[in-house]
Interface confidence: medium
């Protein structure tokens, strides 16, 4: 988790002087409770937005927006703590809005936004807005939380972001898998425009079951420049195992921008309606 760039972040608006500060996610009001505290945020909304860094890179960001309740407690509102928690890693990042002037009621509801939390593709976050000071122990909570799921790199807008492009999102291998005679599969896919190797993982499953009954790895050496964007054809020999008839082919590239962590593409071959009688394995069959 990180903030987009480190340029000055602003939260001021007409009628309010405000500054954005880094936060330890442990506001002082936890340790030194106040008697009078503001009410909770209203209508917290989280949306996926996209923002460019100063270097021109495009990143997905969480656009956080909320409003204030129209009660007298805004007189005691000193700011807000924004917290983003990445659910699969428990990593948390916070910022604090510090109000430098007192809020006053005006003709329309106060609204706040913040769009500088960079989020990762295919990750879920919990976003919390805490009004400050935080409530006394056993006091009514004055925060609001919402979960936010970021789409993966298949999503049209996500595909062109820097993190997705770095992981190979623009490569469309257009995989085709054809069943041949003698327990073989022909896998065909389009190579990308980079001289890097690929790995094909064949995983076979019994009909209607999800534990794998066979797995085999096939290494494809780096193509030469004249082979870029060409189709690569690979014949995989299957093990003649009873009922092991559903095959998933997964292709993993090793692009320089993502190394071992590039997006993988897969295709599946279903079990035939009427499985053929198994034939004996030829002696020359390679051992997986």
């Amino acid at each position: 988790l990180r903030l987009l760039d480190h340029r000055a972040l602003v939260c001021s608006q007409p009628g309010l002087n405000c500054t954005v500060k880094n936060s330890t996610c442990l506001d002082d009001s936890w340790i030194h409770p106040r008697n009078l505290t503001p009410s909770s945020p209203k209508d917290l909304q989280i949306q996926l937005h996209f923002a460019h860094t100063q270097q021109g890179d495009l990143f997905p960001v969480a656009h956080i927006e909320w409003t204030l309740q129209t009660d007298a407690s805004i007189l005691y509102l000193e700011g807000a703590e924004l917290s983003v928690l990445q659910l699969n890693t428990n990593e948390r990042l916070c910022v604090r809005f510090e109000f430098l002037s007192k809020l006053r009621h005006h003709h329309r509801r106060w609204r706040f936004t913040f769009s500088h939390f960079v989020v990762d593709p295919d990750q879920e976050y919990e976003v919390t807005v805490h009004h400050l000071p935080k409530p006394i122990p056993d006091g009514d909570p004055n925060h609001q939380s919402k979960n936010f799921l970021v789409p993966d790199c298949e999503h049209a807008r996500m595909k062109v972001t820097t993190p997705c492009m770095s992981s190979g999102s623009l490569w469309d291998p257009n995989i085709t898998v054809e069943t041949l005679e003698a327990h073989q599969l022909r896998v065909s896919f389009t190579l990308w425009n980079e001289s890097t190797h690929y790995q094909i993982l064949l995983t076979s499953f019994p009909h209607m079951e999800n534990h794998s009954c066979f797995e085999h790895m096939h290494h494809i050496p780096a193509p030469r420049p004249e082979e870029f964007h060409q189709r690569s054809n690979v014949t995989l020999t299957l093990r003649n195992l009873k009922g092991c008839c559903r095959h998933q082919v997964q292709i993993q590239p090793f692009f320089s921008s993502c190394l071992n962590d590039c997006l993988r593409h897969s295709a599946t071959v279903s079990c035939p309606e009427m499985p053929d009688t198994p034939e004996p394995i030829p002696d020359y069959m390679p051992l997986w």
Partner: antibody, heavy 116, light 107 residues
């Protein structure tokens, strides 16, 4: 050269758990799965299960389902086999072996003794 | 599960003689069968896979044959280092299963 080196002998009480490690070297760890086979004293070989070092897929022997967990740590090229709720008849030498179907390299074995 | 039955349980052979070990599957395992040799206090050593293919470094005196349900491991001329227990193993279907073993001892 290919080597599978297992952790040392263990003595456990009934109901406890044991976790045996198997460190691979001499080849690309994620290219081949790791299988686990055990052998009770004076008895034959019994297949326990297999884990894919690439995808994490597992396939366990039915009789051990719910008690056995196989994991890998690709950063250290190490496979682990944990067996829970140990009974006296789990006393055996536990072997890790390379590959899923036919085992071409074996660890030296880890003796696990279950005794009260 | 597929039951693998090995016979005989013990085979007494003199050095230099031929030894024939049998392995029978309760149902067809095609050619998905391996043979292993195990000496006391050691891990099993692979000898044969796919019923008849010798593993790396295995001497030519070891040969495997058969398909379907009946398989044979033949040691053409027994050497002193060949006295051990031999196991067959099928990998045609889950769970993978081993035979009970044949002990080859010096006559």
């Amino acid at each position: 050269q290919v080597q599978l080196v297992q952790s040392g002998a263990e003595v456990k009480k009934p109901g406890a758990s044991v976790k045996v490690s198997c460190k691979a070297s001499g080849y690309t760890f994620t290219r081949y799965g790791i299988s686990w086979v055990r052998q009770a004293p004076g008895q034959g070989l019994e297949w326990m299960g297999w884990i894919s070092t690439y995808s994490g897929n597992t396939n366990y022997a039915q009789k051990l389902q719910g008690r056995v967990t196989m994991t890998t740590d690709t950063s250290t090229s190490t496979a682990y086999m944990e067996l829970r709720s140990l009974r006296s008849d789990d006393t055996a030498v536990y072997y890790c072996a390379r590959r899923q179907l036919y085992f071409d390299y074996w660890g030296q074995g880890t003796l696990v003794t279950v005794s009260s | 599960e597929i039951v693998m039955t090995q016979s005989p349980a013990t085979l007494s052979v003199s050095p230099g003689e031929r030894a024939t070990l049998s392995c029978r599957a309760s149902q067809s395992v095609s050619s998905n069968l391996a043979w292993f040799q195990q000496k006391p206090g050691q891990a099993p050593r692979p000898l044969i896979y796919d019923a008849s293919t010798r593993a790396t470094g295995v001497p030519a005196r070891f040969s495997g044959s058969g398909s379907g349900t009946d398989f044979t491991l033949t040691i053409s001329s027994l050497q002193s280092e060949d006295f051990a227990v031999y196991y067959c193993q099928q990998y045609d279907n889950w769970p993978l299963t081993f035979g009970g073993g044949t002990k080859v001892e010096i006559k």
